[in-house]
Amino acid sequence: LQDLCSNCPAGTFCDNNRSQICSPCPPNSFSSAGGQRTCDICRQCKGVFKTRKECSSTSNAECDCISGYHCLGAECSMCEQDCKQGQELTKKGCKDCCFGTFNDQKRGICRPWTNCSLDGKSVLVNGTKERDVVCGPSPADLSPGASSATPPAPAREPGHSPQ
């Protein structure tokens, strides 16, 4: 029986109870390798999951998360609640980022603002809950009388009127 079963391809199972030894997988089941004694039940994308790829006779269904959630795990084994930018998910739900931290995505944790002074630079744009600080040139790089807040206007090409 072993030799006969190994001839059954993916999408079938080795049916000991039937004269035709390889039987197609029943609806809502699959076998992704040959020689299986039974077909596996298809994954059902229910609740916070939605179907990304339907189950076929040779491959399991693949799930995504419904709107307001995002996948965790390589094959979306879990769905985690989205938060707003400027927030992170805690055990008690979505919480605003603490001062000095930011999150520019709907998932993940709040991360500290960049410390511009570590690179010898100054803060050009202050950070917010949603955005990191923007570092500018160090004070020593600025020529006397130059302003760190407004970069010089680009020179216009001849023949072009202002927009």
Partner: nanobody
């Protein structure tokens, strides 16, 4: 990255019992079929049994049927092999393995499995 870390092997008397564990990390454990194989010195790697992604269907080699049981705890990302009524011929290095998402080989063929544990000696 994908990792399978085994534990629980050792020395056991004939007729005794042993449980092997295989802890998975780096991937969605509950979306893949898993299997146990063994390899005795000088022999080819031998299929022991396989468990579906959701534990819904199992397949055992005749040599271990009724004595060995495979189970899985998906929330803990762990596969188990419970071995009872052990015999001297069960002496081998035991491996857990993750089934590929698709294979043209049979379910009992080593080529159908893409990631393997480091192996556990059972004597």
């Amino acid at each position: 990255q994908v990792q399978l870390v085994q534990s629980g092997g050792g020395l056991v008397q004939p007729g005794g019992s042993l449980r092997l564990s295989c802890a998975a990390s780096g991937w969605a454990f509950d979306n893949y079929g898993m299997a146990w194989f063994r390899q005795a010195p000088g022999k080819e790697r031998e299929f022991i049994g396989r468990l579906a992604w959701n534990g819904g269907s199992t397949d055992y080699a005749d040599s271990v049927k009724g004595r060995f049981t495979i189970s899985r705890d998906n929330p803990k990302n762990t596969l188990y092999l419970q071995m009872n009524s052990l015999k001297p011929e069960d002496t081998a290095v035991y491996y857990c393995a993750r089934q590929r998402s698709y294979s043209r080989y049979g379910i009992r063929a080593p080529q159908t499995y893409d990631y393997w544990g480091q192996g556990t000696q059972v004597t």
